[in-house]
Amino acid sequence: MAVTACQGLGFVVSLIGIAGIIAATCMDQWSTQDLYNNPVTAVFNYQGLWRSCVRESSGFTECRGYFTLLGLPAMLQAVRALMIVGIVLGAIGLLVSIFALKCIRIGSMEDSAKANMTLTSGIMFIVSGLCAIAGVSVFANMLVTNFWMSTANMYTGMGGMVQTVQTRYTFGAALFVGWVAGGLTLIGGVMMCIACRGLAPEETNYKAVSYHASGHSVAYKPGGFKASTGFGSNTKNKKIYDGGARTEDEVQSYPSKHDYV
């Protein structure tokens, strides 16, 4: 029950996280005009990964897409790539995890297969979350660098009295959405990996049979394969061997966790 809950919760948390990553990637407010200690402007500038926008005091908002690919900063391209990779991995992870959910029955899919899929989706969610966090962090670092550079020469003189006010940009809402979403996806991925351990057959509790032959006590223990990783064939609920010759005193031996054939 706890495994199902952990898996289900991991799926939901990852779903919310990936939705957040998609939202952050699409948002225009990755960087917003810094209003603190600046002349009061009748416009508000903000920028996203795909376009920059200006909202005028009348409420009119105008956005211009970055219609160039080669002319964009390498860092921005890198952030775009990280976010897209995060979304793609997350989407695939979601697809895989749907089929891996314990509460969903698909044909005669064995638990080991579900465990494998749960682990795979968990890893995908973790990488997806890390990609989003990395992308947002790279962009934030870029902003901080540019902020202090523009603060250093806040007013650049142009021909004596004439001054140009440099627009400084600070963290936009999308950065916080991205960080939180990346974190949620990461947490969801970890939960899926934890759930995988519970889904995987730790060991198989089969009755073992002892054979007494010529004074030697040799125990033959079938089905003792340990599949704690979640890989390999699932034998947890299958009765492979129960029976065979028993000794006169009906001695039964059960495999311990140290027993291997």
């Epitope: 402007t41 009748a42 416009v43 200006v54 005028e56 009348s58 409420g59 009119f60 211009r64 140009t164």
Partner: antibody, heavy 120, light 113 residues
Amino acid sequence: EVQLVESGGGLVQPGGSLRLSCAASGFTFSSFGMHWVRQAPGKGLEWVAYISSGSSPIYYVDKLKGRFTVSRDNAKNSLYLQMNSLRAEDTAVYYCARAGYAVRNALDYWGQGTLVTVSS
Amino acid sequence: DIVMTQSPDSLAVSLGERATINCKSSQSLLNVGNQKNYLAWYQQKPGQPPKLLIYGASTRESGVPDRFSGSGSGTDFTLTISSLQAEDVAVYYCQNDLFYPLTFGGGTKVEIK
């Protein structure tokens, strides 16, 4: 047709108060920011204040902050300018003007103005 | 505050001739976010309220005759009346539309020579 009609002007003594009104019609008043601009007799235009469509933010020219207060009532399609501690230099024609949409913050429609005379 | 300096103070031009008014701002009115200039030109005839002619430094307001044109960028702007008509006699003002307070130039009075 967009119409802006100012009222409330008149003769007032120095130190007195006056409340100007601007009645708007012909457009969705609640969707537009509004400005007050004044013009002293024979002088140029001087921007006074701006109030956004939702009453926040509000901006004033520094020298009038504290004495002048701009407000609006979207339900009544009305703009107001409360003027306190009036001085002789506040004598001017006061115009209300609409903050145009998609015209780079320009003032696209103006009222005919109301004259405020501050004199003893 | 942004200081808007208009020149000349007054201008006498013959009918049909070109009239040019200059406006200089103490800070650039070019917004980096959209690379647009936030400067407007107004016409005020005697006894009337101002009328918007040009916004964004160069875009004519609807209904404004095409003999009126605006140009310039950053700190230096120009209003040109290509062929002066009798009805163009007025005072012309430039206005900073980027920074609060939205300051106006001192005005240029255009008369017929």
